[in-house]
């Protein structure tokens, strides 16, 4: 019995659903009563899911697996794994026994995009040329371990005096902290790039340091030039700092965070007290850091509706304000591919291939190509619909006339995260039946 699985690992984002494809060729007169199907972990042989005696025996794997019952009779033994976790990563064996039998293993590669790095300086004020500063680049909740690169404003790699640590949390996701020690010149830009090797996703941030003259008491309000990119559901820090004058006390500080366009109050600190969040109770200051001039705002459980510009207004004796942009993003799921019609296909037939990817933000860019990498632009219709949370579901339809055989790939790109999610379908053999990937 020929059991077929994809050669390449199935890449799944943490929290999304993954389909482990497995197909077999049913013999004439085959009935489900004859089918025995076992999915198990390749290494430990732990049972994951099974079908026997004409019945789905259910999930033996945390109730997160399912078969495609309507497709089993056509030879589709694929397994749906829901709410993927880091611990799911590894090899799964699909064992099919009818009269003949066979098995094959498919690899699941789990991934999670890294957040846009935040940059901190120590010391962060009264800097002068010749001072040694420690620049820390931190990026959160990614998988697998990241590759971290530093470079200066001219793009020259900085490799000396770099220490990188990666710690996994209970979910197995990594927080990356990379520390660069440099001696300041007259001024300089330092960039940190955090790469997810599986997703080929690069997240980068930079900091420009202009050494200051002695403080005069003037309030210089500083925010990052680049937008702060935050994943939906995560927390974001809108950085804002000012230079406290000598003898400054928090009793003198008046701090207002508000939406730049509508002037809606978000959070304030005045009369020596944190006045609290005026923005759905999802904001917080860093009270222990205010006295050092850190007026940053923490925005919790980021939503698509939070996207936009936030103004940080500081008034002591002098006053100043600056606006920081929040760019919200959500990774797109690995596309699922469906064919219509999906059986008895012959060269010359016109088929409709649908590529669907879910719950991303902002709107995606969709690209189709053939097995040789040649772009397919004709007869493509793409629609993107936002749900109540503002996340987009993408459906792209390609109409093609079949050749003797062919591979059709769909790539869904998140333009903000620079995250590419792709799916492909190979149509071979005549006549043939396609077991669709769900």
């Amino acid at each position: 019995l020929e059991v077929q699985v994809p050669e390449d690992p199935v890449v799944a984002l943490v929290g999304t659903d993954a389909t482990l494809c497995c197909s077999f060729s049913p013999e004439p007169g085959f009935s489900l009563a004859q089918l025995n199907l076992i999915w198990q972990l390749t290494d430990t042989k732990q049972l994951v899911h099974s079908f026997a005696e004409g019945q789905d025996q259910g999930s033996a794997y945390a109730n997160r697996t399912a078969l495609f019952p309507d497709l089993l009779a056509q030879g589709n033994a694929s397994l749906r794994l829901q709410r993927v976790r880091v611990a799911d990563e590894g090899s799964f064996t699909c064992f099919v026994s009818i009269r003949d039998f066979g098995s094959a293993a498919v690899s699941l590669q789990v991934a999670a995009p890294y957040s846009k790095p935040s940059m901190t300086l120590e010391p962060n004020k009264d800097l002068r040329p010749g001072d040694t500063v420690t620049i820390t680049c931190s990026s959160y909740q990614g998988y697998p371990e990241a590759e971290v690169f530093w470079q200066d404003g001219q793009g020259v790699p900085l490799t000396g005096n770099v220490t990188t640590s990666q710690m996994a949390n209970e979910q197995g996701l990594f927080d990356v902290h990379s520390i660069l020690r440099v001696v300041l010149g007259a001024n300089g830009t330092y960039s940190c790039l955090v790469r997810n090797p599986v997703l080929q996703q690069d997240a980068h941030s930079s900091v420009t340091i202009t050494p200051q003259r002695s403080p005069t008491g003037a309030v210089e309000v500083q925010v990052p030039e680049d937008p702060v990119v935050a994943l939906v559901g995560t927390d974001a820090t809108l950085r804002c700092s000012f230079s406290p004058e000598p003898g400054f006390s928090l009793a003198q500080l008046n701090l207002i965070w508000q939406l730049t366009d509508t002037k809606q109050l978000v959070h304030s600190f005045t009369e020596g007290r944190d006045q609290g969040s005026a923005y759905a109770n999802r904001t917080a200051l860093f009270p222990d850091l205010l006295a050092q001039g850190n007026a940053s705002l923490r925005l919790q459980r980021v939503r698509v509706a939070d996207e936009g510009s936030f103004t940080c207004f500081v008034s002591i004796r002098d006053f100043g304000s600056a606006a920081v942009s929040l760019q919200v993003a959500a990774p797109y799921s690995k596309p699922s591919m469906t064919l219509e019609p999906n059986k008895d296909l012959r060269p010359g037939d016109t088929v409709t291939i649908t590529c669907s990817s879910y719950r991303g933000y902002p709107e995606a860019e969709v690209f189709w190509q053939d097995g040789q990498g040649v772009p397919l632009t004709g007869n493509v219709t793409t629609s993107q619909m936002a749900n109540e949370q503002g996340l987009f579901d993408v459906h792209s339809v390609l109409r093609v006339v079949l050749g003797a055989n062919g591979t059709y790939s769909c790539l869904v790109r998140n333009p903000v995260l620079q995250q590419d999610a792709h799916g492909s379908v190979t149509i071979t053999g005549q006549p043939m039946t396609f077991p669709p990937e769900a």
Epitope: A218, Q252, N254, Q264, F313, R317, D318
Partner: antibody, heavy 118, light 111 residues
Amino acid sequence: EVQLLESGGGLVQPGGSLRLSCAASGFTFSSYGMHWVRQAPGKGLEWVSAISGSGGSTYYADSVKGRFTISRDNSKNTLYLQMNSLRAEDTAVYYCARGYYYYGMDVWGQGTLVTVSS
Amino acid sequence: QSVLTQPPSASGTPGQRVTISCSGGSSNIGSNPVNWYQQLPGTAPKLLIYGNNKRPSGVPDRFSGSKSGTSASLAISGLRSEDEADYYCQSYDSSLSGWVFGGGTKLTVLG
């Protein structure tokens, strides 16, 4: 002694322009935000515009936005207000004031009169 | 029409205590400190109270300020004839991104 001295007021026709100056002395000018506040004859105080110590941030009342421009020259310890497209309702005594804690204004000039009339 | 509302006038006799109110909203007095100014006839305004209740040096302790919610008040005890002046409250309004004044209260000392 801390002092602010306004100048540049006068009579101007509607639609005309005028530039007010405020010379500061007796304190580190660049360490303080500065304001322009006006008072029409027989009326109350109206805040017009403000500028941060470095000049990097500026603020305007809606009534003058797009017509007035505040600026400062810290090397000359001088604050300016460029007033364009003047209207009769801009007629007032214009005061410059030094920014203070809690959004206050602790030092005021003696004022300069701007009259917009044909 | 001023963002902060003050009574146009108030009066009292020497030695009396008078109070001047200033009413605003959540985006100004409700969330930011209040300052008070005294303007004697023909002169520039002078800072009288800052940060709701603090007196700059040189201001007599007969003048006091307080704030509650979206309102503030200036109290003058032991009224003197030289207190006859216009009094203005002022705050910062976050929804306007600007400083705002009350319309002013003319205080008359009788007798």
